[in-house]
């Protein structure tokens, strides 16, 4: 029995619903009484949802899963996962048994966009060319871990003297703090780009330091 799932991971935003697609080709005369469908976590084999003896056996996964009962007879064994969490990320196996059996695994990739970075400066007054300053770029509640890039006003990448830390909160979402230490020129714009590698989403923050005063666009 051939069971088909998408090759590419299913990307779902935290808090939204995701559909894990799975299909099979029913033979002529197929009835739901013959169908046994099991969704499980691939690695741990934990049961997620099942259908047997013509009946939806329900969710075994925090009551956040559902099948598409009206579509099962046409060979649609897809699973709806509600209110996606970071902890849901991973591989799900769709197992279908009729007269023969087959299975396939689909990957769920969870994502959350990063907030617009906030920029802070230390020290933040009486700055003169030649002073060393610490610029901190902070972006919150994203997933997965971000890629952080710094550049100056001319678009030249700044890679030295950058320290980036990422901490996961209780939901598994990351707060990113990236610190750039620079020696001030006469005028300077410093930009921080926080990229979500899954969503290909860029969040920008910048600070412009002019003799005095300073501006934070």
């Amino acid at each position: 029995l051939e069971v088909q799932v998408p090759e590419d991971p299913v990307v779902a935003l935290v808090g939204t619903d995701a559909t894990l697609c799975c299909s099979f080709s029913p033979e002529p005369g197929f009835s739901l009484a013959q169908l046994n469908l099991i969704w499980q976590l691939t690695d741990t084999k934990q049961l997620v949802h099942s259908f047997a003896e013509g009946q939806d056996q329900g969710s075994a996964y925090a009551n956040r899963t559902a099948l598409f009962p009206d579509l099962l007879a046409q060979g649609n064994a897809s699973l709806r996962l509600q209110r996606v969490r970071v902890a849901d990320e991973g591989s799900f196996t769709c197992f279908v048994s009729i007269r023969d059996f087959g299975s396939a695994a689909v990957s769920l990739q969870v994502a959350a966009p990063y907030s617009k970075p906030s920029m802070t400066l230390e020290p933040n007054k009486d700055l003169r060319p030649g002073d060393t300053v610490t610029i901190t770029c902070s972006s919150y509640r994203g997933y997965p871990e971000a890629e952080v890039f710094w550049q100056d006003g001319q678009g030249v990448p700044l890679t030295g003297n950058v320290t980036t830390s990422q901490m996961a909160n209780e939901q598994g979402l990351f707060d990113v703090h990236s610190v750039l230490r620079v020696v001030l020129g006469a005028n300077g714009t410093y930009s921080c780009l926080v990229r979500n590698p899954v969503l290909q989403q860029d969040a920008h923050g910048s600070v412009t330091i002019t003799g005095q005063p300073m501006t934070f666009p």
Partner: antibody, heavy 119, light 109 residues
Framework: QVQLQQSGAEVKKPGSSVKVSCKDS????????ISWVRQAPGQGLEWMGG????????NYAQKFQGRVTITADESTSTAYMELSSLRSEDTAVYYC????????????WGKGTLVTVSS | EIVLTQSPATLSLSPGERATLSCRAS??????LGWYQQKPGQAPRLLIY???NRASGIPARFSGSGSGIDFTLTISSLEPEDFAVYYC???????????FGQGTKLEIK
């Protein structure tokens, strides 16, 4: 030619346990359903239980429930059948069998493992 | 639990003759019925699956038929190597559980 290679003959005391192994030389245990069938001397075939390794779910004939444990190690393509609280009537040849990928039919069989229970 | 009853217990025939082996289920088993051949000192060999489908490498003289509770294995013209014990087997839908009949011994007359 794919073969199921079973472990060697065992002699066991009543009350003890035996664990028989069955290695799939094709190395593709995951996509198969594995069954264990026994045959006492001069008797017929008796299905004991089976496992679908990809699910990790085993099920057993009512007669053996609570006394038999069937497991599978996908990394080594080996299935195991452990029978506990042995008695003399458990003396039999124990076979493992499987179908082709996705098939429940028992079209490939091991050569059998003789387990003798004697005090 | 479904019980399979095979008849006759022993069948004595000569090479070249037609053999008809019967298997009756205590309740309907749908199409999940197979037949196995076993020779002394050997593991069983699948002959027929899903009532009437010949397994790989099985000669055309073996055929299966039936539905519901009554099933038949027919060997159209017996060859010397066909004398053996034959078992019918049923599989439940889910979970997959199996039952064998008690066997029919086909012996040379």
């Amino acid at each position: 030619q794919v073969q199921l290679q079973q472990s060697g003959a065992e002699v066991k005391k009543p009350g003890s346990s035996v664990k028989v192994s069955c290695k799939d030389s094709g190395g593709t245990l995951s996509s198969h359903a594995i069954s264990w069938v026994r045959q006492a001397p001069g008797q017929g075939l008796e299905w004991m239980g089976g496992i679908i390794p990809i699910l990790g779910i085993a099920n057993y004939a009512q007669k053996f429930q609570g006394r038999v444990t069937i497991t599978a190690d996908e990394s080594t393509s080996t299935a195991y059948m452990e029978l506990s609280s042995l008695r003399s009537e458990d003396t039999a040849v124990y076979y493992c069998a499987r179908g082709g990928p996705g098939s429940y039919h028992m079209d490939v069989w091991g050569k059998g493992t003789l387990v003798t229970v004697s005090s | 639990e479904i019980v399979l009853t095979q008849s006759p217990a022993t069948l004595s025939l000569s090479p070249g003759e037609r053999a008809t082996l019967s298997c009756r289920a205590s309740q309907s088993v749908g199409s999940s019925l197979g037949w196995y051949q076993q020779k002394p000192g050997q593991a069983p060999r699948l002959l027929i699956y899903d009532v009437s489908n010949r397994a790989s490498g099985i000669p055309a003289r073996f055929s299966g038929s039936g539905s519901g509770i009554d099933f038949t294995l027919t060997i159209s013209s017996l060859e010397p190597e066909d004398f053996a014990v034959y078992y019918c087997q049923q599989r439940s839908n889910w979970p997959p559980m199996y039952t064998f009949g008690q066997g029919t011994k086909l012996e040379i007359k």
